[in-house]
Interface confidence: low
């Protein structure tokens, strides 16, 4: 018998059929059944927690307390619901070891020297713009640095091609209008080759092929890490090199960083569907 709903987890939700809820009222739909905004559905003797969030596609990235980046706060809450575990927003902008890199996603991103604006005039600033009340005419300032962002051409909703998602965000900020990713590759002439993986997501083949080659060469020189390094790599395998004192991480596809703790946005995974794109 399960001790909690998490013991009944399925890929789409939680299914706890076949339990007598007169003996164990844990599986009744009440306010405590589905945590983290899950919707509790009771069909016959089955209780299921469903996480069907209607998240918009705004790219307002946040970093979760699990070290993962999300397209916006709604997707973070959806992940918390699916995992049935608490994920807090720890900072605005994608997770980065260098917290002071200044992506411009938050009011205090970067050096931290900008002053907090208190008045409602700042409410007009949208799409990642920061408010500068000291400016004489333009209050909304776009302090978005895309210089460190990898090349990953995209076609945006304004009909223009951009080198990466960051540039789309920058354009959206500068124009103060909603500009979204429409498709992978440049507009009309889509040069980026995509391949569909088993889970129905699309990924760049050039990246996947390179990753496989790197993976093969890495295996030759590395041995598994000692047991006390469990958890050293968040999204990848821990390997110990004979030449190195510190272990290293071989990251799963789509992750980067010393501990595979960061989402790698050089690979854009896209959920197929009518103009509904999602970073996952």
């Amino acid at each position: 018998f399960p001790t909690s709903l998490s013991d009944c987890q399925t890929p789409t939700g939680w299914n706890c059929s076949g339990y007598d809820d007169r003996e164990n009222d844990l599986f009744l739909c009440d306010t405590n059944t589905c945590k983290f905004d899950g919707e509790c559905l009771r069909i016959g003797d089955t209780v299921t927690c469903v996480c069907q969030f209607k998240c918009n596609n705004d790219y307002v990235p946040v970093c979760g307390s699990n070290g993962e980046s999300y397209q916006n706060e709604c997707y973070l809450r959806q992940a918390a619901c699916k995992q049935q575990s608490e994920i807090l927003v720890v900072s605005e902008g994608s997770c980065a070891t260098d917290a002071g890199s200044g992506s411009g996603d938050g009011v205090h991103e970067g050096s931290g020297e900008t002053s907090q604006k208190e008045t409602s005039t700042c409410d007009i600033c949208q799409f990642g713009a920061e408010c500068d009340e000291d400016a004489e005419d333009v209050w909304c300032v776009c302090n978005i640095d895309c210089s460190q962002t990898n090349f990953n051409p995209l076609c945006a909703s304004d009909g223009k091609s951009y080198d990466n998602a960051c540039q789309i965000k920058e354009a959206s900020c500068q124009k103060q209008e909603k500009i979204e990713v429409m498709s992978l590759g440049r507009c009309q002439d889509n040069t980026t080759t995509t391949t569909k993986s088993e889970d129905g997501h699309y990924a760049r083949t050039d990246y996947a092929e390179n990753a496989n080659k790197l993976e093969e060469s890495a295996r030759e020189h590395h041995i598994p890490c000692p047991e006390h390094y469990n958890g050293f790599c968040m999204h990848g395998k821990c390997e110990h090199s004979i030449n190195m004192q510190e272990p290293s991480c071989r990251c799963d596809a789509g992750y980067t960083g010393q501990h595979c703790e960061k989402k790698d946005y050089s690979v854009l995974y896209v959920v197929p569907g009518p103009v509904r794109f999602q970073y996952v």
Epitope: S65, E73, V90, A99, G106, H108, Q116, E118, M234
Partner: antibody, heavy 120, light 107 residues
Framework: DVQLQESGPGLVKPSQSLSLTCSVT?????????WSWIRQFPGNKLEWMGF???????KYNPSLKNRISITRDTSENQFFLNLRSVTTEDTATYYC?????????????WGQGTSVTVSS | DIVMTQSQKFMSTSVGDSVSITCKAS??????VAWYRQKPGQSPKLLIY???NRHTGVPDRFTGSGSGTDFTLTINNMQSEDLADYFC?????????FGGGTKLEIK
């Protein structure tokens, strides 16, 4: 400039309730941010007690969950701490503070603190 | 709860020196760490947020670094007004927790 000011009784008897008020000036508590209560015990240990957010939702420290409630009066721009069934171990300096920004729960504005002694 | 450990309860230093205060989290807190300075009889003041971002008005002699579980606050060119208690705080998960504090004293 944003200012926070705690007020309330300095002496509370054991088993009674402790009620403190945080008055905020320079910013509306409904406009944004998270409004926390933190206490500092003799010996300087700090404990986050909980917050009320701009939208009125709460988060509490589980160690206090059955005894604590944080409420607000938006018309007076104040938020309140109520701690039930106090013991001598609740003797501390109580601070109210504001979270730095959405998505960052470090605290940039603090009140000057109010000392509370629990004694019969 | 995540435990924040400041192993040095007291540290002795001299004006003009550099000093590094460390804080260790019992589990990965990404970069969700803040540092505060508290002078006697005053409330804590925010110095660093998100592990390495200086808060508005904080002198650049204060530097925060680290991610995951190990964090450091470095004070360069130590000034007499820096003699105080320093606390780290994690806000990666509820409940938010503080380190026990490190008191900087004059040698």
């Amino acid at each position: 400039d944003v200012q926070l000011q705690e007020s309330g009784p300095g002496l509370v008897k054991p088993s009674q309730s402790l009620s403190l008020t945080c008055s905020v000036t320079g910013y509306s508590i409904t406009s944004g941010y998270y409004w926390s209560w933190i206490r500092q015990f003799p010996g300087n240990k700090l404990e986050w007690m909980g917050f009320i957010s701009y939208d009125g939702s709460n988060k509490y420290n589980p160690s206090l969950k059955n005894r604590i409630s944080i409420t607000r009066d938006t018309s007076e721009n104040q938020f309140f701490l109520n701690l039930r069934s106090v013991t001598t171990e609740d003797t501390a300096t109580y601070y109210c503070a504001r979270g730095l920004r959405r998505g960052d729960y470090s605290m940039d504005y603090w009140g000057q603190g109010t000392s509370v002694t629990v004694s019969s | 709860d995540i435990v924040m450990t400041q192993s040095q309860k007291f540290m002795s230093t001299s004006v003009g020196d550099s000093v590094s205060i460390t804080c260790k989290a019992s589990q990965n807190v990404v970069t969700a760490v803040a540092w505060y300075r508290q002078k006697p009889g005053q409330s804590p003041k925010l110095l660093i947020y998100s592990a390495s971002n200086r808060h508005t008005g904080v002198p650049d002699r204060f530097t925060g670094s680290g991610s995951g579980t190990d964090f450091t606050l470095t004070i360069n060119n130590m000034q007499s007004e820096d003699l105080a208690d320093y606390f780290c705080q994690q806000y990666s998960s509820y409940p938010f927790t503080f380190g026990g504090g490190t008191k900087l004293e004059i040698k």
